[in-house]
Amino acid sequence: AAPCPDACCPHGSSGLRCTRDGALDSLHHLPGAENLTELYIENQQHLQHLELRDLRGLGELRNLTIVKSGLRFVAPDAFHFTPRLSRLNLSFNALESLSWKTVQGLSLQELVLSGNPLHCSCALRWLQRWEEEGLGGVPEQKLQCHGQGPLAHMPNASCGVPTLKVQVPNASVDVGDDVLLRCQVEGRGLEQAGWILTELEQSATVMKSGGLPSLGLTLANVTSDLNRKNVTCWAENDVGRAEVSVQVNVSFPASVQLHTAVEMHHWCIPFSVDGQPAPSLRWLFNGSVLNETSFIFTEFLEPAANETVRHGCLRLNQPTHVNNGNYTLLAANPFGQASASIMAAFMDNPFEFNPEDPIPVSFSPVDTNSTSGDPVEKKDETPFGVSVAVG
């Protein structure tokens, strides 16, 4: 093939090489950028900055090499448009530092920075960590900090991410209240901070106030939907990012729903209960307290992380006609109580001729004098059982 006279020449099916001395001062308008997977740049003394706009449109880029050039600064968001980048070689440039944000979100298998006049400060703590953890081929480069010494020797005791403390109200929060949260940020070299409120949606009206080092957030006219929703404070410095999430508990009365019994491995009377704080539950059978056993018991489904409602079943293991009847679920918390009832028929009564069915073992009437709230066992009402051989 004839020699290529351009600043950048095709290399393989999806590569580009730019090696003509001093031909580039930016990476705008590279030919065939959309399909490039490999870009090799060398001897470009005028290429001093790499910024977000430079790599726009290079979404397929996997390998980027900029060597023996004049690169002094790589923007923290420079690789935002190249999420597939896996090899980055910036050796023998004029880089004094490289932000942790530059490589955040990339899955770099290789990062080469040797031959740069790196300057050791907390801003390179992330790179020191890569060296310690054997990431990206960094340890083999034995990186030096200009005028100082090996990166590995840089003291890092003071190189921490910001410390966050979020103050939430101690008092009970009711539906309709306004809630003030405050996020206190401490640490050196604070750069940015803010709130992440993506989970809140319609749970409250949001008003932000203040700035570093103390951020305020007012949640006005809160609803019960605010429960279990994360309110996150974040802050960044030259070392990295810290996040702290809190939840605001909005009190509201208990509620309950019952659904028709369904036959699964066991029978199940499905229910849903809600309330904050979480309500206590009690089952009644035909108006009497139902004492749970290994044959009849409450089972909860795995709760959803972001809601207060709990779903579950009253499980009945091979129920018979004696278990047919009216089931009531009582739910109560300090802000209110609720109940729901449902009729369940598991099996026809084989003793239709006998009007006096035995009382099931596990039930006793509600003792209206009881103050403990626990069922009271009555010794003189011990039921008897009947066993029938069939066939």
Epitope: E96, P117, H119, S121, C122, A123, Q144, H146, G147, Q148, G149, P150, H153, M154, P155, A157, S158, C159, R188, G189, L190, N237
Partner: antibody, heavy 119, light 106 residues
Framework: QVQLVQSGAEVKKPGASVKVSCKAS????????MHWVRQAPGQGLEWIGT????????SLAQKFQGRVTLTRDTSTSTAYMELSSLRSEDTAVYYC????????????WGQGTTVTVSS | DIQMTQSPSSLSASVGDRVTITCRAS?????LYWFQQKPGKAPKPLIY???TLGSGVPSRFSGSGSGTDYTLTISSLQPEDFATYYC?????????FGGGTKVEIK
């Protein structure tokens, strides 16, 4: 023990050059960066630049670029700082100092070389 | 360049006094160094990365601080402590020094 011994005092005319030496002993000369700092009479300390004797890499404060040359001779474990186009405000004591990366600070200093620029 | 501002520029104190010198950086730095210099002598390293005492430095000297504000404290001033003290940063190039604090005998 680790020592840095500098050359003696110099008196120079404006426009001339001066070359100050700093002989290292008691450690591996090529392993540690050597820095140069100056102090004008009654004034504070001012960083000039640094050289890595292992490969002659250098960095200079912007103020001194074009006027200062840092060199080294590994055979004699000596670092040199040459300042050209001297002016009266270059009158100062010039120090060499080693950056000790094990503890990350300027741990050993030369005794200083007084350079006087006077017509 | 990061500017280092020391205060006070000079102070008079007596033997046994507690002395505090402050150093403020124009932007947040990673760590700080303190040097002691006596007339006609080279600076002597006193404290490195903010709070670690240099070799042979008496425990009456201590350093603290973070971000932009740092302090050198001499808990009980001794005759040999009368000197000029300099702070120095190397968070970014070039390394810069404070203007110095001269501690004199009252």
């Amino acid at each position: 023990q680790v020592q840095l011994v500098q050359s003696g005092a110099e008196v120079k005319k404006p426009g001339a050059s001066v070359k100050v030496s700093c002989k290292a002993s008691g450690y591996t000369f090529t392993t540690y960066w050597m820095h140069w700092v100056r102090q004008a009479p009654g004034q504070g300390l001012e960083w000039i630049g640094t050289i890595y004797p292992g490969n002659s890499d250098t960095s200079l404060a912007q103020k001194f670029q074009g006027r200062v040359t840092l060199t080294r001779d590994t055979s004699t474990s000596t670092a040199y700082m040459e300042l050209s186009s001297l002016r009266s405000e270059d009158t100062a004591v010039y120090y060499c100092t080693r950056f000790y990366f094990e503890d990350w600070y300027f741990d050993v200093w030369g005794q200083g070389t007084t350079v006087t620029v006077s017509s | 360049d990061i500017q280092m501002t020391q205060s006070p520029s000079s102070l008079s104190a007596s033997v046994g006094d507690r002395v505090t010198i402050t150093c403020r950086a124009s932007s947040s730095i990673s760590w700080l160094y303190w040097f002691q210099q006596k007339p006609g002598k080279a600076p002597k390293p006193l404290i490195y990365y903010t709070s670690t005492l240099g070799s042979g430095v008496p425990s009456r000297f201590s350093g603290s601080g973070s971000g932009t504000d740092y302090t050198l404290t001499i808990s009980s001033l001794q005759p040999e402590d009368f000197a000029t003290y300099y702070c120095q940063q190397w968070h970014s190039y070039p390394p810069t020094f404070g203007g110095g604090t001269k501690v004199e005998i009252k």
